[in-house]
């Protein structure tokens, strides 16, 4: 009988509010055993592989996506999938990549935490969450959005 | 009102364990990441590690296989094995989250202070 | 491993007066830098980040910039209150955080 696949994480690093230009880091994570994880935008069509696995830990996989200078164009949901022979997992929640204008340089305003979508986790979009700080000083304008639905 | 306290400091003889418990209050930690900083007496401070709001660990090069964070709904513990002299220090629990940063700390508890020595 | 190389280790100052403190990363880190003030007894506050934002309710006496990898703190107006340690650190990714050695200000 096959086993039933966990959904996979995707956390970012440093973090989901990236300032233009700077660097951020997508972390998909799985169980043992993954082949290819996947890295998907809004559309399914629109994804990247790779077979670069390494342990996290004795019972986690993950893989790592960089961007090495993220645009407006970068702006938006992201998840990750799976295949771990003979099948395909099902997908991680969304998270949100936001991308921060800046004055000056790769550095400015702030904005609310939330930072990784678990299994059970809703995606990381504060502006639906009861228990994320308000925001301080930052405003819409700043912000490249890419609006979607659930 | 925001807050984080440690807790579980004290004296260890070398070789021993400890486990040292962050209790937080005003927020959910199912929404922030919390990470766990260390200073040793007069110098300077040294990160050791953080969990995730999903529960994925990670930790500075040093500090893999001696420490483990964990956390429940309202806690993180940070567990220390086979202890030296030279893990006496103050221990400091963070919550990271600031500017949407993982490990970008900006709410910090005093900090429990633990001595290793025979 | 990233490595924070914080200069000088200790400085002093008058009342009113201004010091700079460096901060060289090891690699590029973008503008992934924060700044903390540290009182004795106490935990880290957070003073800024992303190079040269500040927190929420810190003073613009307390600047910061970036310069490829190396990052330069400022604390202008100097009051006695400013007595501290100071450290940078880097927030770059989960695997290479890391904090500077740290510089004592001390003021006349």
């Known amino acids: 009988q096959e086993e039933d696949l966990p959904r996979p994480s995707i956390s970012a690093e440093p973090g989901t509010v990236i300032p233009l230009g700077s660097h951020v880091t997508f972390v998909c994570r799985g169980p043992v055993g993954v082949q290819t994880f996947r890295l998907e935008r809004e559309s399914r069509s629109t994804y990247n592989d790779t077979e670069d696995v390494s342990q996290a830990s004795p019972s986690e996989s993950e893989a790592r996506f960089r961007i090495d200078s993220v645009s407006e164009g970068n702006a938006g949901p992201y998840r990750c999938i799976y295949y771990k022979p003979p099948k395909w997992s099902e997908q991680s929640d969304y998270l949100e990549l936001l991308v921060k204008e800046t004055s000056g340089g790769p550095d400015s305003p702030d904005t609310e935490p939330g930072s990784s979508a678990g299994p059970t986790q809703r995606p990381s979009d504060n502006s639906h969450n009861e228990h994320a700080p308000a925001s301080q000083g930052l405003k819409a304008e700043h912000l490249y959005h890419h609006h979607h639905h659930h | 009102e925001q807050s984080v306290e440690e807790s579980g400091g004290g004296l260890v003889a070398p070789g021993g364990s400890l486990t040292l418990t962050c209790t937080v209050s005003g927020f959910s930690l199912s929404n922030y990441h919390m990470g766990w900083v260390r200073q040793a007496p007069g110098k300077g401070l040294e990160w050791i590690g953080y969990i995730y709001t999903h529960g994925t660990t990670f930790y500075a090069s040093w500090a893999k296989g001696r420490f483990t964070i964990s956390k429940t709904s309202t806690t993180v513990d940070l567990k220390m094995t086979r202890l030296t002299t030279g893990d006496t220090a103050t221990y400091f629990c963070a919550r990271g989250g600031y500017a949407d940063y993982n490990i970008l700390y900006n709410l910090w508890g005093p900090g429990t202070l633990v001595t290793i020595s025979s | 491993e990233l490595v924070l190389t914080q200069t000088p280790a200790s400085v002093e100052a008058a009342v009113g007066g201004t010091v700079t403190i460096n901060c060289q990363a090891s690699q590029s880190i973008s503008s992934y830098l924060a700044w903390y003030q540290q009182k004795p007894g106490q935990p880290p506050k957070l003073l800024i980040y992303?190079?040269?934002d500040l927190a929420s309710g810190v003073p613009s006496r307390f600047k910061g910039s970036r310069s490829g990898t190396e990052f330069t703190f400022t604390i202008s107006d100097l009051e006695c209150a400013d007595a501290a340690t100071y450290y940078c650190q880097t927030y770059d990714s989960s695997t290479t955080a890391a904090f500077g050695g740290g510089t004592e200000v001390e003021i006349k």
């Open positions: 992303d190079a040269s």
